[in-house]
Interface confidence: low
């Protein structure tokens, strides 16, 4: 009943709680003298479903037949109506539609730890919708049992609180959990176990780690585990991989030695425990362990390659540039590389340790034969030396890699295409294709790039630092034995119509043409490789077409003579530049008269 | 630089199908990714389709969500010709259509990534 009901009642036939599908009849009766005053005809008795009129019957009682109420908890309410009055609430009932539960599935048990207590889980199948009571029972041996219940709705685990021990371990013990509620019953299938069946170890714990002699090929994990573990599984990663490295170990006591860890990397471990070989489940994993495994001296050699600049009749500046080793090769943190630069016919050699760099300029003389040697050192030793004679790297013409073309291809990067040199092309022992920014001015500080190709490929695809709307210079090295050729062309990833147009900082006049001088674009509004510049002219104050003169891009370009225009006749000139993707606007206009009449 | 021909665009009925082409000169579409941009009368122009050239096999479609299922774009190397079949076109479909290549890779939708454009070809579909 869910109120006093002081005023009349409400039963429900067969019950209160009924198997879903079933039909309830539900009466409304009021107690003697609680109808409408004066007259009991007029009583108007009211059943609602929740909030909504189901029935209405003139009199001192109602009855109601009810079918298909839906699973969970239905509220009628029973009221009275008399005339020029607000309804009066009799009486109330809950109705609990439901079903019997079903059959307990998956019944399993779990120890955890040699010290920790058994628990059971089960699937209680599909909701009852009802107040549903689990018994769970254990039977051991020497006719023992344990009984624990559980009333939450939601019942599908229980925990006995009861040790089972090691003294017999092949002992059976048997769970069954039985289901009770007011439409039925139904017990698990049993299951019966043993210790050894159930206990699943306490996951390792105090996980150590130990390199020998600071060498990762000695290298010994230590850990502690419960009393009675007999395999372990160990499981270990750097930590920036997602594939784990697994390995299975018998009667470790808690030390395992691993042979195939990387020098200076980061590792994570982690640890797994279990009884018995084939009985019971295995432990979690352990917390892991991290730790850095110990530097080794670097293998493989640097990457090295270097750019010769005249400076005078007799010195000349060499820059070397070498590529960092990869992590597996530097095996630690690099202190330092060291170049040795050698004049091999006298024998003079210096020898200099670079520190945060990956790049060394110095000017040596023009004359002698000249080497160089760069390694990389770390706390435990030196990288083999990369040794390269220094030579001119273009000066074999026949050599020179032939039909060198630069596309776009794709973002940010450049497909390099070349046809081998005309000279036997079974000489070619590599070629390398070298790129940097193209700064008008032929920055040397400019950073270099550069990849080495096998001679048999005649294309290399370059995206190492190609930034988009910038113009890169690419050169294209064929190498074999102490000769080389080259050849060079502009190439850009993506490009679009200059920004600007070049600045006209000067019109002279020269014996009847002029020469007009200009200042570059800057880089970063020349929005790719520049191909050629236009010089337009009109008359002052003409509306006719301008003439133009377009002259190829070159980098060290900024004057040109032009010898078509009328003396005594005042012209405007401008330029614009023009990339693949077309024309810049008009640079600044400047006005010019021959004949010295220059405004 | 490629320079485009669109073709094949006419009066048609609700629900019928139509074939645009693209033919391009200048020089082959390697490399190129080629893009259907349409623009109807008062209203910006908006990204269709686009297919991307890898050397001479097509390595990449994208279509713009409110004709994926009906549109269909492909082309044909030989011919250096990318085309855009439209099938259950609807009344919302008249539009100018252009198209667009460029030798970028970067944002398939955005006009101002390409850099050779079309005249465009007239498509009306009559209700």
């Known amino acids: 009943k869910i109120d006093a009901c002081k005023r009349g009642d409400v039963t429900v036939k067969p019950s209160h709680v009924i198997l879903l599908g079933s039909t309830v009849n539900i009466t409304c009766s009021l107690k003697p003298r609680q109808g409408c005053f004066h007259y009991s005809r007029r009583n108007k008795l009211i059943l609602y479903k929740f909030d909504r009129r189901i029935n209405f019957h003139h009199g001192h009682s109602l009855n109601s037949q009810v079918t298909g109420l839906p699973l969970g908890t239905t509220l009628f309410v029973c009221k009275l109506a008399c005339i020029n009055s607000d309804e009066i609430q009799i009486c109330g009932a809950e109705i609990f539609v439901g079903v019997a539960p079903e059959q307990p599935q998956n019944l399993s048990c779990i120890q955890k730890g040699e010290q920790g207590t058994v628990a059971c889980t089960w699937e209680r199948g599909r909701d009852t919708h009802l107040y549903t009571e689990y018994t769970l029972q254990l039977s051991g041996p020497k006719n023992l049992t344990w009984q624990k219940q559980c009333k939450d709705i939601y019942c599908d685990y229980l925990d006995f609180g009861i040790n089972l021990t090691p003294e017999s371990p092949e002992s059976n013990f048997t769970a069954k959990v039985t289901a009770v509620n007011s439409l039925g019953s139904s017990s698990s299938l049993p299951s019966t176990f043993t210790f050894l069946d159930i206990v699943r170890p306490l996951p390792p714990w105090d996980i150590r780690i130990k390199f020998q002699k600071a060498s990762v090929s000695r290298c010994t994990l230590y850990w502690r585990d419960e009393g009675l573990v007999l395999l372990n599984r160990l499981r270990y990663r750097p930590s920036n991989s997602r594939l784990w490295n697994m390995v299975n170990v018998t009667k470790a006591k808690g030390r395992h030695d691993l042979l195939d860890l990387k020098p200076f990397t980061e590792y994570e471990f982690q640890i797994s425990s279990k009884l018995h070989l084939y009985k019971g489940s295995w432990s979690d994993w352990s917390e892991s362990l991290r730790a850095q495994t110990p530097e080794e001296e670097p293998t493989g050699m640097l990457d090295v390659w270097y750019m010769k600049r005249h400076i005078d009749y007799s010195r000349q500046q060499i820059s070397l540039f070498w590529k960092n080793l990869s992590v597996s090769e530097a095996r630690g943190k690099i202190l330092h590389y060291q170049v040795t630069l050698q004049e091999l016919t006298g024998g003079k050699a210096m020898t200099q340790n670079i520190t945060g760099h990956t790049s060394w300029t110095t000017v040596i003389p023009r004359t002698g034969n000249w080497a160089v040697a760069v390694s990389a050192a770390n706390s435990k030793g030196s990288s083999l030396p990369t040794r390269i004679n220094i030579m001119n790297l273009c000066e074999a013409g026949l050599l020179a890699p032939r039909q060198v073309s630069a596309n776009s291809e794709g973002m940010d990067n450049i497909l390099v295409t070349w046809q081998p040199p005309r000279k036997d092309p079974s000489a070619v022992q590599e070629y390398v294709v070298e790129w940097r920014e193209l700064h008008p001015g032929g920055d040397t500080q400019v950073p270099l790039n550069w990849l080495r190709s096998r001679p048999y490929n005649v294309s290399a695809l370059i995206s190492e630092n190609i930034k988009s709307y910038i113009c890169y210079e690419i050169r294209v090295y064929a190498l074999s034995g102490d000769q080389g050729g080259c050849s060079s062309i502009l190439g850009n990833s993506k490009h679009k119509a200059p920004l600007s147009g070049p600045h006209i900082n000067a019109i002279t006049e020269e014996k009847g043409s002029i020469l007009i001088s200009w200042n570059s674009i800057p880089v970063q509004e020349q929005m790719g490789c520049l191909l050629h510049y236009r010089i337009y002219w009109k008359e002052r104050d003409s509306n006719s077409q301008p003439q133009l003169c377009e002259i190829p891009y070159r980098v060290s370009q900024n004057s040109h003579p032009i010898n078509s225009l009328q003396p005594r006749v005042t012209y405007v000139l401008w330029m614009t530049a023009l990339t693949a993707a077309g024309e810049s606007s008009h640079g600044n206009e400047r006005e010019f008269c021959l004949q010295g009449k220059a405004n | 630089e490629v320079q485009l021909v669109e073709s094949g665009g006419r009066l048609v009925q609700a629900g019928d199908s139509l074939r645009l082409s693209c033919a391009a000169s200048?020089?082959?579409?390697?490399?190129?990714?080629v893009g259907w941009f349409r623009q109807a009368p008062g209203k910006e122009r908006e990204f269709v389709s686009a297919l991307r050239w890898s050397s001479s096999n097509i390595d990449y479609t994208y279509y713009a969500d409110s004709v994926k299922g009906r549109f269909s774009i492909s082309g044909d190397y030989a011919k250096n010709t990318v085309y855009l079949q439209m099938n259950s076109l609807k009344a919302e479909d008249t539009a100018v259509y252009y198209c667009a290549a460029s030798t970028s890779w970067g944002v398939l939708e955005s006009d101002t990534e390409y850099t050779s454009w079309g005249q465009g070809t007239q498509v009306t579909v009559s209700s």
């Open positions: 200048g020089r082959t579409f390697t490399n190129y990714r």
